[in-house]
């Protein structure tokens, strides 16, 4: 008789999981020479264990402190950048600007990105069928609870300057229920930071407003003034030309706006 | 975190030259605009010269084109203004500042930079 399986209302778990899982981490550690002492089928088998045979709806940020003590890494505290609804161009710009690093570019970060995953309670089975949905079935969701987790100690590592990269093409500029405003924003250690520097990507060509006047960003700056860390804001007027001009600063094109 | 800090400020006499240096010290990425303001006693700031991200693109106040250069160099973390034909009506002091973006669409308005130096002062006497 087939077992009844519970019906969540995400996607579920992609496809050849623990194979992605595992051949990221060893490619990973491959490139990184700090992180080549990493046992990876200790790292994967400290992630499955975060999530399998447990509610996915009942994940805590304990069930990931094995994983998260095998992928400790150290990254220079002044070279961290966030990002906020505006993923790609983040980490278009670290692969260029390759002193910077989003937590993409750590091996944690690198391991989940762009993945889903979710087990079921009292089976070892991963459930590739569905997975729950933050808003419709539950925030304590293997996923959430992942990137929280990695989220809070990347923003608790931060010093000096750190830099958030906003979508300026959204209503929400800064948006108080993303990973950065409601994470990241309030795991900033003021004794340890200096100023959060907000770069706003403008969307249209033809866009010249002071985007850094906006609403949201002055609630951003609210928010940071009042944990005592400076607040700086920044226009990226043409973000294509931008990576451009970073990638090659000698370039022609790179002597009007960007 | 990002200091902007002025130095080359001083006393000389009318038509000589000064070279003003401001370092911008703390940054890991120099892709913004910089400028260079002054503020005469009891006065508002005033725009003085700019220069783009990458230094290729200059703007100059009419008070100071023909006589002051501006530049930078991104790898030292330095901006110059180079001041030539000094008038005692350029006596004030003078700050460097970060622009909120790349290029000079800005340059000129005070709201368009977040980041300011101390100031130096230039006094030059007829």
């Known amino acids: 008789v087939p077992r009844w399986r519970q019906q969540w209302s995400g996607p579920g778990t992609t496809k050849r999981f623990p194979e992605t899982v595992l051949a990221r981490c060893v490619k990973y550690t491959e490139i990184h020479p700090e992180m080549r002492h990493v046992d990876c089928q200790s790292v994967w088998d400290a992630f499955k264990g975060a999530f399998i045979s447990k509610h996915p709806c009942n994940i805590t940020e304990e069930d990931y402190q094995p994983l998260m003590k095998l992928g400790t890494q150290t990254v220079p505290c002044n070279k961290i950048l966030l990002w906020s609804r505006i993923k790609d161009l983040a980490h278009q710009f670290t692969q260029v600007q390759r002193d910077m690093f989003t937590l993409e570019d750590t091996l944690l970060g690198y391991l989940a990105d762009d993945l889903t995953w979710c087990g079921e309670f009292n089976t070892s089975k991963i459930n590739y069928q569905s997975c729950p949905d933050w808003r419709k079935d539950c925030s304590n969701n293997p996923v959430s609870v992942f990137w929280k987790t990695v989220s809070r100690r990347f923003a608790e590592a931060a010093c000096d300057v750190v830099h958030v990269m906003l979508n300026g093409s959204r209503s929400k500029i800064f948006d108080k229920n993303s990973t950065f405003g409601s994470v990241e924003v309030h795991n900033l250690q003021p004794e340890k930071v200096q100023t959060l520097e907000a770069w706003v990507i403008h969307g249209g060509r033809e866009d010249s407003r002071d985007l850094c006047q906006d609403p949201t960003i002055k609630e951003l700056e609210s928010i940071i003034s009042k944990r005592n860390i400076q607040f700086s804001c920044k226009n990226i007027y043409r973000p294509d030309k931008f990576l451009q001009c970073v990638k090659n600063p000698e370039d022609s094109s790179c002597t009007s706006e960007i | 975190d990002v200091q902007l800090q002025e130095s080359g400020g001083g006393l000389v006499q009318a038509g000589d030259s000064l070279r003003l240096s401001c370092e911008f010290s703390g940054r890991t990425f120099s892709g913004f605009a910089m400028g260079w303001f002054r503020q005469f006693p009891g006065k508002e700031r005033e725009f003085v010269a700019a220069?783009?991200?990458?230094?290729?693109?200059?703007d100059y106040s009419d008070s100071v084109k023909g006589r002051f250069t501006i530049s930078r160099d991104n790898v030292k973390q330095m901006m110059y203004l180079a001041m030539n034909s000094l008038k005692p009506e350029d006596t004030a002091v003078y700050f460097c500042?970060?622009?909120?973006?790349?290029?000079?669409?800005?340059?000129?308005?005070?709201?368009?930079?977040?980041?300011w130096g101390r100031g130096t002062q230039v006094t030059v006497s007829s």
């Open positions: 220069i783009n991200w990458s230094g290729s693109d200059t």
């Open positions: 500042a970060e622009a909120r973006s790349a290029g000079l669409g800005s340059s000129r308005r005070i709201e368009g930079y977040d980041k």
